[in-house]
């Protein structure tokens, strides 16, 4: 025997008080699947959260963060303060990256500069708080006379 509630589409609930007819979800609630016996309360984007997508009878609201903050967690469950490039967020707020570290984004932590010598390379451009170092060719590649390419001999003219 088929459950009469299975005929109730998304956006409704199966109303046991009214002979299991399909009743529309109340305002500020939704059902995203059919056959539900209740609707779900819409998420409210308040405070630092702002509404990215309004709640409808068939889908929940979606939030993002107000300027100066960014989303964290599944479905933007949290908003975290932005910092400037060259900074990281600590318990005491935004702090400049320590020497030898950088952050090129408004979020996340300061990361150590690349150690060029580990790859046998030299530092071509020094790092800053906002940018990683740029590694260049290895020191051996740069020493004079190290080139293995010999220029071609000049072509001789016939009869010489």
């Amino acid at each position: 025997l088929q459950d009469p509630c299975s005929n109730c589409p998304a956006g409704t609930f199966c109303d046991n008080n009214r002979n299991q007819i399909c009743s529309p979800c109340p305002p500020n609630s939704f059902s995203s699947a059919g056959g539900q016996r209740t609707c779900d309360i819409c998420r409210q984007c308040k405070g630092v959260f702002r509404t990215r997508k309004e709640c409808s009878s068939t889908s929940n609201a979606e939030c993002d963060c107000t300027p100066g903050f960014h989303c964290l967690g599944a479905g933007c469950s949290m908003c975290e303060q932005d910092c400037k490039q060259g900074q990281e967020l600590t318990k005491k707020g935004c702090k400049d990256c320590c020497f030898g570290t950088f952050n090129d984004q408004k979020r996340g932590i300061c990361r150590p500069w690349t150690n060029c010598s580990l790859d046998g390379k030299s530092v071509l451009v020094n790092g800053t708080k906002e940018r990683d170092v740029v590694c260049g060719p290895s020191p051996a590649d740069l020493s004079p006379g190290a080139s293995s390419v010999t220029p071609p001999a000049p072509a001789r003219e016939p009869g010489h």
Epitope: F13, D15, N17, R18, S23, C25, P26, P27, N28, S29, Q36, R37, T38, C39, D40, I41
Partner: nanobody
């Protein structure tokens, strides 16, 4: 026991006005989410308007915005729906509804009353 008693319906010409009342007992309208749903002939239920939360924020279906006004009289424990610029498509049985929030997080509503018939016709 929760009881809802609707009144104020009737026959009205297009462009006319009506004021529906819902006398509530068994709960306090000022402390609950309450509203109006309607059922047109041969159609399903449709939410018309609601007062949500004790702060009194209001909801209106797009089809009635600017024409219907929901209000409540806390002293009389009564909910009202002032309907103006009525159209033939507003013809329906209007029910007073109380939104019910369940412990598991679900939302439903009950319409305990018999409803009041509104007919818009010339």
């Amino acid at each position: 026991e929760v009881q809802l008693l609707e009144s104020g319906g009737g026959l009205v010409q297009p462009g006319g006005s009506l004021r529906l009342s819902c006398a509530a007992s068994g709960f306090t309208v000022s402390a609950e989410d309450v509203g109006w749903v309607r059922q047109a002939p041969g159609k399903g239920l449709e939410w018309v308007s609601a007062i949500l939360d004790s702060g009194g924020s209001t909801y209106y279906a797009e089809s009635v915005k600017g024409r219907f006004t929901i209000s409540r009289d806390n002293a009389k424990n009564t909910l009202y729906l002032q309907m103006s610029s009525l159209r033939a498509e507003d013809t329906a049985v209007y029910y007073c509804a109380r939104v019910v929030y369940h412990a598991g997080g679900g939302v439903t509503y009950d319409t305990r009353g018999q409803g009041t018939q509104v007919t818009v016709s010339s």
